[in-house]
């Protein structure tokens, strides 16, 4: 059976029908447990140093949100008015709202334990590695033990507002030239 | 297990177009990029460009942009490389590998390759 | 575009004697950056990821260290099998770039 915890790091070895493969052992997230915080630098906490999104292709990220993410968020809160919430999360600019994408996204909060494993965070951390030059170094870096087993999806009113402010922030990512409400 | 198949060799006229085809198994296609990467004969490696199913789009090394179009039919798996306006200097093996992209970020799989010799 | 110039380009060397292998980025690309090893004929394979992770299956006289712009892949003691080109890799950025290989041969 599979093994609870999983070490991040860990490669295997085998041969392939012709060509060379090394199979990730723990294809799971890596993850993050760092709690969420407000940040107006574009810098997210991780571990001792900070990951600054100011070199990120935006373009690139503004149209896989256009093209897939931003669908995937519509799908999660479906069925849920749009003025339900209130955006109480603001971001001032491209690699500010980043940030706070990042933070919201994959940083459990109180009454909402995981986001990480819905489609369109997956989506998010993979547009965050292609496009965010050494984030991916980022995410290998954190190597606490994290349980294999997937947790169940709770879809609760406190991650459905954690969603809607998702929508805010990527909605404000892709107007960078607005002025600051 | 992971395997990588590459299509057959292929011997092009200077001019016409290639594609090269890559099925993927014993994986979640949607897991991973697909990046192709080429090796002319007796040189180093070229990144060509990648294309993301999980994002169902594509980012190419400038110098092949508008030559070089990677797609990718995720019913069966299968990545393709498309070359245009081949010239002698495009004969090279053509690798496909994947990476992850939400974990490993590594290309740790590798096709078998597929020789493209451009000749008149 | 990052440059990852490798050096040396030959190193001639005997079985059971430690192999350094340098490679040097044009900028700073912290950690990102792989090492595999390719033999003729065949595709590249993965020893080295993220500058000093290690992969099971591969032996343990290969492992890698460096950050920022300098990397290197040190094999302890070389086999028979080890005589072979190996490249670096940069992933920190697109386009993704090689470095121009280091050949491994028997002295």
């Known amino acids: 059976g599979l093994n609870d915890i999983f070490e991040a790091q860990k490669i295997e070895w085998h041969e392939g029908g012709g060509g060379s493969e090394q199979k990730l052992i723990s294809e799971e997230d890596l993850g993050s447990s760092h709690h969420h915080h407000h940040h107006s630098s574009g810098l997210v906490p991780r571990g001792s140093h900070m990951y600054d999104f100011t070199n990120c292709d935006f373009e690139k990220i503004k149209a896989a949100y256009l093209s897939t993410i931003s669908k995937d968020l519509i799908t999660y809160m479906s069925g849920t008015k749009s003025t339900e919430f209130n955006n109480t999360v603001s971001c001032s600019n491209r690699p500010h709202c980043l940030t706070e994408i990042q933070s919201l996204t994959f940083n459990p909060t109180a009454g909402c334990a995981s986001l990480a494993k819905e489609m369109f965070a997956m989506k998010t951390k993979a547009a965050l590695a292609i496009w965010c030059p050494g984030y991916s170094e980022t995410q290998i870096n954190a190597t606490q033990a994290m349980k294999k087993r997937r947790k169940r999806k709770v879809t609760t009113n406190k991650c459905l507002e954690q969603v809607s402010q998702l929508q805010g922030l990527w909605r404000r990512f892709n107007r960078p030239l607005l002025k600051q409400q | 297990q992971v395997q990588l198949v590459q299509s057959g060799p292929e011997v092009k006229k200077p001019g016409s177009s290639v594609k090269v085809s890559c099925k993927a198994s014993g994986y979640i296609f949607t897991d991973y990029a697909m990046h192709w990467v080429r090796q002319r004969p007796g040189q180093d490696l070229e990144w060509m460009g990648t294309f993301i199913p999980l994002l169902d789009t594509s980012d190419y090394n400038q110098n092949f942009k508008g030559r070089a179009t990677i797609t990718a039919d995720k019913s069966t798996s299968t990545a393709y490389m498309e070359l245009s306006s081949l010239r002698s200097e495009d004969t090279a093996v053509y690798y496909c590998a994947r990476m992850g992209v939400t974990h490993s970020y590594v290309m740790d799989a590798w096709g078998q390759g597929t020789l493209v010799t451009v000749s008149s | 575009e990052i440059v990852l110039t490798q050096s040396p380009g030959t190193l001639s060397l005997s079985p059971g004697e430690r192999a350094t292998l340098s490679c040097r980025a044009s900028?700073?690309?912290?950690?990102?950056v792989h090492w595999y090893q390719q033999k003729p004929g065949e595709a590249p394979r993965l020893l080295i990821y993220?500058?000093?992770q290690s992969i099971s299956g591969i032996p343990d006289r290969f492992s890698g260290s460096g950050s920022g712009t300098d990397f290197t892949l040190t094999i302890s003691r070389l086999e028979s099998e080890d005589f072979a080109v190996y490249y670096c890799?940069?992933?920190?950025?697109?386009?993704?770039?090689f470095g121009r290989g280091t050949k491994v041969e028997i002295k």
């Open positions: 900028q700073h690309i912290s950690r990102s």
């Open positions: 993220f500058a000093s």
């Open positions: 890799q940069q992933s920190y950025s697109f386009p993704y770039t």
